[in-house]
């Protein structure tokens, strides 16, 4: 059962796993949620009645019964992890803690104009977990405006003390705000020869990479496959770091794979969710339960529903034994990974899907594309919405994209002459405009946020956000699309599609069925040559065939230019403007979304 509220002046007795330091009870709850075994916690706030050495302690706890006896204690705040909850979870913590010095290994000291600049520096530094900034009022003259970047083995402070005139905070890497490069490549036959900070067992290099991503100290990894010559090292995932942040030596070795932490792209690819099944593979660990199950899929469901289960092994039924049900072994370990992985015993293994809610919803795989044709099928573009105006009569106005459960991203030029959000309706999960009747449910618009530098589509900043009056419940037909990572600026997208109900030629009408067209991206230099009378800025992106024929057109505005990269769809562009429609050597011009990620996050994450 999901319990979100905190219990004041209450302490959970026993069940201690480990103690960390956090600046608040709220953050203690987040740390507990992300810890592989923690189900409950007790945090000690600063209080005159408490020993100062116990202030800010966050004791992570576990219990077979999922609860522990409660004891009254002043200044103690207790609660439950969000593991038991179904809602989306994020480790993003933008809070700034005044008069707190969060202790760690101070590895960089520099002058910063503000705490915000210090936090940005931490976010863009590969090693930084948190920072402390001495304000202008700090007593020591030489330390005023000093920004200390810090890291620890756990990613949380080793101690927190009161210190007047300083502020502390965490890196915003987990808020998708880092400018660090996002390197998704996995290098075959490669060993990174740098210091190991930890090692775990993993069934493949992808799981190893995901484990590296959410390990606070891991910057890159090496994985030894099951064909690795040294038997004791098979399926070993070595988590690594280096002072420079990059591997110092790469050694060519067959049957080894290496790669990088995906911390700078973790909002747009799954890092917690290991959804694959591993056939003829047994995961060893502490046994939680053995239950009968019809299939390995059913076994995974059982594991997902058992809050303490981390991974499982399913042994299929022998012939007609046990009504055709096999044995489902629910397992756990201290770090969430199997203690050993064995092959050739006939088992089918996998992981709990409970952690999938820690990943961005937008990373979920959607149904396969229908190849060929121009008409879409239901659920093919679940982020696409149709934005209607009701004044003077109801009609399709623009396209848009779901980017959060209360947010639609669209183009600013759609709102020319729109006096109030009250006349707007957002319809999601729609394939045909004819489906929209008087009683069709829609989302009202609470607020229209237009970029304050927007003047006209051709001069850029053609971007707007719609805040919905109610939240979108994600389903197969309505779900968000990922924003591109800032660290992905150099990615060359090759699988891009423009979608919308817009005209199919310049003098036409709105289409009934959602149309799709695969369109190649065009470099800004090439695009500039085609639009000599305009300035094609880096905040714009162009797409189109040289010979024309396929393009976005009137009515598609505000809709997505969606590009698939590493099995995840990204909102690369917003349909903005162009000369005519699908004209030869006149590519469509789109708002380059990656350049507005900060603006989007600032507006959507505002308290």
């Amino acid at each position: 059962e999901c319990v979100t509220q905190l219990l004041k002046d209450t302490c959970f007795e026993g069940g201690d796993i480990t103690t960390v330091f956090t600046p608040s009870a709220k953050y203690c709850q987040v740390v507990c949620t992300y810890h592989p075994r923690c189900l409950l916690f007790t945090f000690t706030a600063e209080s005159p009645s408490e020993d100062p050495t116990r202030w800010f302690t966050c004791v992570l706890k576990d219990s077979v019964t999922e609860t522990l006896p409660r004891v009254n204690r002043t200044a103690a705040i207790s609660g439950y992890s969000f593991k038991q909850c179904s809602h989306q979870i994020s480790a993003c913590n933008k809070d700034i803690y005044v008069d707190l010095d969060m202790k760690g290994i101070n590895y960089n000291s520099s002058v910063a104009k503000s705490a915000q600049e210090c936090q940005e520096r931490c976010t863009d530094d590969v090693h930084c977990h948190f920072f402390t900034y001495a304000t202008r009022q700090f007593p020591s003259l030489e330390h005023r405006n000093i920004c200390l970047l810090k890291h620890t083995q756990t990613g949380t402070p080793t101690r927190i003390t009161k210190l007047d005139k300083v502020v502390s905070g965490f890196s915003l890497k987990s808020c998708a705000l880092s400018n660090l490069a996002c390197i998704r490549d996995i290098f075959p036959n490669t060993v990174f020869a740098d210091s190991n900070i930890d090692s775990v067992m993993a069934p493949d290099a992808f799981v190893c990479g995901r484990i590296c991503t959410h390990h606070p100290g891991c910057l890159f990894f090496t994985f030894f496959s099951q064909e690795w010559p040294k038997e004791s090292q098979r399926n070993l995932c070595l988590l690594k770091t280096s002072e420079s942040g990059l591997p110092s030596t790469r050694i060519k070795k067959s049957k080894a794979l290496s790669g990088f932490s995906l911390q700078s792209c973790r909002h747009s690819i799954p890092v917690f969710c290991h959804s694959s099944f591993y056939h003829d593979t047994d995961f060893l660990g502490e046994e939680l339960d053995i239950v009968a199950a019809k299939s390995h899929e059913a076994c995974q469901k059982l594991c997902t529903n058992a809050v303490r289960c981390q991974f499982f092994t399913y042994t299929p039924a022998q012939a007609s034994c046990n009504e055709g049900k096999g044995k489902c072994y629910l397992k756990l370990s201290s770090n969430g990974s199997p203690t050993k992985i064995l092959h050739g015993r006939g088992g089918i293994s996998g992981y709990t899907l409970r952690l999938c809610k820690m990943d961005n919803e937008c990373t979920t795989k959607i149904k396969p594309r229908i190849v060929g044709g121009t008409a879409s099928v239901r659920g093919e573009w679940p982020w696409q919405v149709t934005l209607h105006t009701t004044s003077p009569t109801q009609r399709h106005l623009c396209g848009g994209s779901i980017i959060g459960n209360q947010w639609i991203l669209t183009a600013a030029h759609c709102f020319y002459g729109v006096e109030s959000p009250k006349i707007l309706r957002v319809y999601s999960g729609i394939l045909n405009q004819s489906e929209i009747k008087e009683d069709t449910s829609f989302f009202g618009v609470q607020e229209i946020i237009i970029h304050d530098q927007y003047k006209m589509a051709e001069s850029g900043y053609d971007i707007a956000l719609l805040k919905l009056e109610t939240t979108v419940n994600y389903t197969d037909s309505q779900r968000p699309i990922c924003l591109p990572s800032k660290g992905d600026r150099n990615v060359i997208y090759t699988d891009c599609w423009v979608t919308g109900w817009g005209y199919r030629k310049l003098r036409d009408k709105i289409q009934n069925t959602l149309q799709k067209a695969k369109i190649p991206l065009v470099t800004n230099e090439e695009c500039q040559k085609r639009y000599r009378g305009h300035k094609i800025t880096h905040k714009m992106i162009c797409a189109g065939y040289r010979e024309g024929g396929k393009d976005a057109c009137k009515g598609d505005s505000g809709g997505p230019l969606s590009c698939k990269h590493n099995e995840v769809w990204h909102l690369v562009g917003i349909t903005s403007w162009g000369e005519g429609c699908a004209q030869r050597e006149r590519p469509g011009v789109y708002t380059n979304v990656v350049e507005y990620v900060d603006w989007i996050l600032e507006k959507t994450q505002a308290v």
Partner: antibody
Framework: EVQLVQSGAEVKKPGASVKVSCKAS????????MHWVRQAPGQGLEWMGI????????SYAQKFQGRVTMTRDTSTSTVYMELSSLRSEDTAVYYC?????????????????WGQGTTVTVSS | EIVMTQSPATLSVSPGERATLSCRAS??????LAWYQQKPGQAPRLLIY???TRATGIPARFSGSGSGTEFTLTISSLQSEDFAVYYC?????????FGGGTKVEIK
């Protein structure tokens, strides 16, 4: 042993420039600030400026602004102080002195390690 | 800039006696004050920082007090090696400034 070793005495003509070096050893060079202080013959101590060897940022006393340049070379753990447009009143002993430890935040400190001093004489 | 004024300019004391040196700031420097000792031909040596904290290796006979604008350095029992010039310095605002010094001589 923590020490600061300065370059030797200099004799300069008015209008010339002088560059004094200060080599640090026995500690992490980039973790502490470095000050320059001078003392004219028979006079008191006068603060000239400060450099943060980590980032190279500087702050100078108004009196020396435009004439003084403080730099550092992290590869040799050395800081430099260059004073240009010398005049006779710049005749003094120039000291480098280690300042605050910048890798930790604390309230109070002093200049705890000093170089042996470099005598600069400006005379025509 | 903050002006630091030391008094007296010269203090004549017999060995074994107590010496009290004063330093006044033209505006509050909180506790951001240090004391240095300088002997002829030598570089200054840090004695006290934070107005009252003894630097490493400084004997207990040296003590500092005060905050705001009024500060005192006390040498409880003068030894022969203590005869020197003493400077106070503020660390509260740029530019850092020193007092004119107090010369402690043998009476």
């Amino acid at each position: 042993e923590v020490q600061l070793v300065q370059s030797g005495a200099e004799v300069k003509k008015p209008g010339a420039s002088v560059k004094v070096s200060c080599k640090a050893s026995g500690y992490t060079f980039t973790s502490y600030s470095m000050h320059w202080v001078r003392q004219a013959p028979g006079q008191g101590l006068e603060w000239m400026g400060i450099i943060n060897p980590s980032g190279g940022s500087t702050s100078y006393a108004q009196k020396f602004q435009g004439r003084v340049t403080m730099t550092r070379d992290t590869s040799t753990s050395t800081v430099y102080m260059e004073l240009s447009s010398l005049r006779s009143e710049d005749t003094a002993v120039y000291y480098c002195a280690r300042g605050a430890y910048l890798m930790e935040l604390y309230y109070y400190y002093g200049m705890d390690v000093w170089g042996q001093g470099t005598t600069v004489t400006v005379s025509s | 800039e903050i002006v630091m004024t030391q008094s007296p300019a010269t203090l004549s004391v017999s060995p074994g006696e107590r010496a009290t040196l004063s330093c006044r700031a033209s505006q509050s420097v909180s506790s951001n004050l240090a004391w240095y000792q300088q002997k002829p031909g030598q570089a200054p040596r840090l004695l006290i920082y934070g107005a009252s904290t003894r630097a490493t290796g400084i004997p207990a006979r040296f003590s500092g007090s005060g905050s705001g604008t009024e500060f005192t350095l006390t040498i409880s029992s003068l030894q022969s090696e203590d005869f020197a010039v003493y400077y106070c310095q503020q660390f509260n605002d740029w530019p850092l400034t020193f007092g004119g010094g107090t010369k402690v001589e043998i009476k």
